[in-house]
Each structure stands twice: as structure tokens, then as C-alpha cells.
């Protein structure tokens, strides 16, 4: 399995998505586990509802939640109030009997909030009405993108509050592609700050 890297800011929420074939994994419960060492076991953190028809109900274990869109084929894990100790290797799993299939290997990286210890400088960000709770950096395993762009909303309004920034952020980071993320909130399109940085992190 390749490894997908999701990057989040300490103190914020990080949302991890694991797509899967909904027919292949039909009727199966899912789980999120933490890899203990390179060859060690994967320790269960949280699993979906015991009743498969209730899989899309959000289940919590501490600060970690899981919910499964069984029709769309997407398992979503939310790590609330991300902390440095949350960094590490995880797996999304599909359960059948005592067996578990790996849907995706995930490397969680935790960034410090740079505004806690440095000036935001001349950066302009969406104002008070915008929410960054679900913002995350997803490092995909696809080839690096040829160009990068910033959503137009990033240059339109002054910084209304201390919104978190990745520590490596600068106006036009090389190889950084900012994609538009669908969100149920009322943010304008392009302002949801879902960064997709294309870099190869294969761990065959």
C-alpha cells in the first residue's frame, strides 16, 4: 500500500478521508487503527457502529471520530484538537470476521501554529466569518503538479483572527496545489483551505 500524508495544525481538527469500493466492502464495518512500529500491530482507535445500517452515525473515542458513507464509499476520520503525539502512521481498515483489509495507510503530520510564535507579516486571509476547522493538508501519492495557484479568496480580506498556517507556508510554495474542497459550511468556493501537495510518499 502507498501511504497518504495528511497534515494538520496543532490545536485544530484534521479530517482524514479513505475512499473505498462500496460494493467490494458492502456490509463491512470499518476501523481506524494506529500502527505500532514499522512491523508492529495496528492498534484499534475507533470503529464504526456495530450495526452496519447505522455506520454513518459518528462514533467517538476520546478526540477521534469515525463515520462511514457506505453508499458513497468514503470513510472519514476526524482528529479533534490535534496534538503532536497524534503524529504517526495509521490505517483505515475494512473488517470481516476477525480479518481486516487495509483501505489506506495514512501518515498524520502535525504542524505548529506559526501565529503562536511569529508575525503573520503581510499575509491576507479570509475574515472573521470564515471557518478553518476542517482545513487540512493532504499529501497525495500522485505525481507532483506542474504548477500551483492560490484561491482568489486568499488575497481579498484582511486577517480577521489568528487562523492557523502551515509552518512552511509562503505566497507561492513550489509544488503546492491548493484544491477546492466541498464543504457543508457556507464558505465561498475556494476558501476552504484544503491544500493538496503532490509529493510521492510511496511505502510499497
Amino acid at each position: 500500500h502507498n501511504t497518504t500524508v495528511f497534515q494538520g495544525v496543532a490545536g485544530q481538527s484534521l479530517q482524514v478521508s479513505c475512499p473505498y469500493d462500496s460494493m467490494k466492502h458492502w456490509g463491512r464495518r470499518k476501523a481506524w487503527c494506529r500502527q505500532l512500529g514499522e512491523k508492529g500491530p495496528c492498534q484499534r482507535v475507533v470503529s464504526t457502529h456495530n450495526l452496519w445500517l447505522l455506520s454513518f452515525l459518528r462514533r467517538w473515542n476520546g478526540s477521534t471520530a469515525i463515520t462511514d458513507d457506505t453508499l458513497g464509499g468514503t470513510l472519514t476520520i476526524t482528529l479533534r484538537n490535534l496534538q503532536p503525539h497524534d503524529a504517526g502512521l495509521y490505517q483505515c481498515q475494512s473488517l470481516h470476521g476477525s480479518e481486516a483489509d487495509t483501505l489506506r495507510k495514512v501518515l498524520v503530520e502535525v504542524l505548529a501554529d506559526p501565529l503562536d510564535h511569529r508575525d503573520a507579516g503581510d499575509l491576507w486571509f479570509p475574515g472573521e466569518s470564515e471557518s478553518f476547522e476542517d482545513a487540512h493538508v493532504e499529501h497525495s501519492i500522485s505525481r507532483p503538479s506542474q504548477g500551483s495557484h492560490l484561491p482568489s479568496c486568499l488575497s481579498k480580506e484582511p486577517l480577521g483572527r489568528r487562523n492557523p498556517l502551515p509552518t512552511h507556508f509562503h505566497p507561492s510554495p513550489p509544488g503546492l496545489h491548493l484544491s477546492h474542497q466541498d464543504s457543508s459550511s457556507q464558505r465561498p468556493l475556494g476558501c476552504s483551505l484544503a491544500w493538496t501537495e503532490a509529493r510521492d510518499t510511496s511505502t510499497q
Epitope: 458492502w26 456490509g27 447505522l54 454513518f56 452515525l57 459518528r58 453508499l71
Partner: antibody
Framework: QVQLQQSGPGLVKPSQTLSLTCAIS??????????WNWIRQSPSRGLEWLGH?????????EYAVSVKSRITINPDTSKNQFSLQLNSVTPEDTAVYYC??????????????????WGQGTLVTVSS | DIQMTQSPSSLSASVGDRVTITCRAS??????LNWYQQKPGKAPKLLIY???NLQSGVPSRFSGSGSGTDFTLTISSLQPEDFATYYC?????????FGQGTKVEIK
């Protein structure tokens, strides 16, 4: 509005099969946003969830551990209804049986599941 | 299975009284709890879902609170039509279970 109408015999002999039907109006048994449940109530056991069925690309059913080996819930899409079959009944299975719709709450997001519409109930007595 | 224990099993109250019914789960169920009202010869009726959310059409005098193992249903000002039996129900476990009921009678 959504309504559930139950039908079936009120008297079943021990060791035989209890069969009830629940006809749905105002919703579809094939809805992917609902589950269709059977629940029973007796003085000795109180309210007891028996199982449910739901359509998620294919039909899927799940049953309470206490009746798992004896129960079947089936859909009938042509009549927009679902049925309960409980095998090898004993006097302990004497109860009022209800069908109910299971729905998912939108507040809080992805956290609510409840029985919002119920059938009128059918008293089933198991006796020879 | 998760056991749901309601208290009291019955209570007597007058119209206008504030009534509180509690429900305790044998293990933590987060907010996975519903409240129903049942009148004699009728099916249960949903009042509160996910511990604290009022079902559409239910009077605002009904409210629910709690999380984990301890939950409360409160009727702020009891009305004549509220004399009934009330049940809690959890949906955390693979076998959803109900409390044994609390009967609210006229004093």
C-alpha cells in the same frame, strides 16, 4: 404523511411461525435514508428491539442477539411493505408487536437515530 | 446488552409541576439516547432524540439532557395530556435497548 399499517394473525400455536406485515404509505421501503424495524412489548420483557432491514444498493438486515436464530425480516418492494417471521415461538413470545421507521437525525450531525413513525401494534398471543 | 435503568418507576404529580425522569446506562453511550412517550393502547411517540434534540411537533416544555451514562427528561410544566409512561432507548449497542419505563400519574 408517513403511515405504517400492520396486519397478521393475533393467535399463533407454540412451535409454529409468527408472521406479520407492515405496509408503508408516504415513504418507500427501498429508501436509502431509513431502516425498517420490528419492536415488541410485553409486561415481562418491556420494549424489545428485534431487528431491522434497509436498502443500501442491496438489502441488508440485522437482528437482536436474543432472536437472531429465529427471525427473518423481508422487504416486498412491489407492495411497499416489509414482514416479520419469527420461528419456533413459545408463550414467551406473546407480546404487542410494532413496526417502526428508523430515521437519522441531522442535528447533531450524523449522531441521531430514532424510531419516528410506528405502526398501530398487533397483539400476538402464543397459545395452543 | 447495555442495560437502561429508569428512575423512578412511577411518580405522582399535579398539572403545572416540573417533572424530572432519569435514565442510567450500564456503560457509556455518548449521546446515543432517545426518549418516548406512550399512552395506554397506543404506540410509543418520539419526544427527544440524541439526548437533547426536540422532535418536530413536540411541545417545548419537554427537554432532554445528559451524556455518557446519565440522562434526564424534564417536563417544565406538566399538562393534562402528559400523563403517560416514558421510556429511554439507547442505540450505541448492536442490540438497541429500552428502559423499563416511568409512569407519570395524576396526584
Amino acid at each position: 404523511q408517513v403511515q405504517l399499517q400492520q396486519s397478521g394473525p393475533g393467535l399463533v400455536k407454540p412451535s409454529q411461525t409468527l408472521s406479520l406485515t407492515c405496509a408503508i404509505s408516504g415513504d418507500s421501503v427501498s429508501s436509502s435514508s431509513a431502516a425498517w424495524n420490528w419492536i415488541r412489548q410485553s409486561p415481562s420483557r418491556g420494549l424489545e428491539w428485534l431487528g431491522h432491514i434497509g436498502y443500501r444498493s442491496k438489502w441488508y438486515n440485522e437482528y437482536a442477539v436474543s432472536v437472531k436464530s429465529r427471525i427473518t425480516i423481508n422487504p416486498d418492494t412491489s407492495k411497499n411493505q416489509f414482514s416479520l417471521q419469527l420461528n419456533s415461538v413459545t408463550p414467551e413470545d406473546t407480546a404487542v408487536y410494532y413496526c417502526a421507521r428508523g430515521m437519522y437525525g441531522s442535528v447533531p450531525y450524523k449522531e441521531g437515530y430514532y424510531f419516528d413513525i410506528w405502526g398501530q401494534g398487533t397483539l400476538v398471543t402464543v397459545s395452543s | 446488552d447495555i442495560q437502561m435503568t429508569q428512575s423512578p418507576s412511577s411518580l405522582s404529580a399535579s398539572v403545572g409541576d416540573r417533572v424530572t425522569i432519569t435514565c442510567r446506562a450500564s456503560q457509556g453511550i455518548s449521546s446515543d439516547l432517545n426518549w418516548y412517550q406512550q399512552k395506554p393502547g397506543k404506540a410509543p411517540k418520539l419526544l427527544i432524540y440524541a439526548a437533547s434534540n426536540l422532535q418536530s411537533g413536540v411541545p417545548s416544555r419537554f427537554s432532554g439532557s445528559g451524556s455518557g451514562t446519565d440522562f434526564t427528561l424534564t417536563i417544565s410544566s406538566l399538562q393534562p395530556e402528559d400523563f403517560a409512561t416514558y421510556y429511554c432507548q439507547q442505540y450505541t449497542d448492536e442490540s438497541m435497548t429500552f428502559g423499563q419505563g416511568t409512569k407519570v400519574e395524576i396526584k
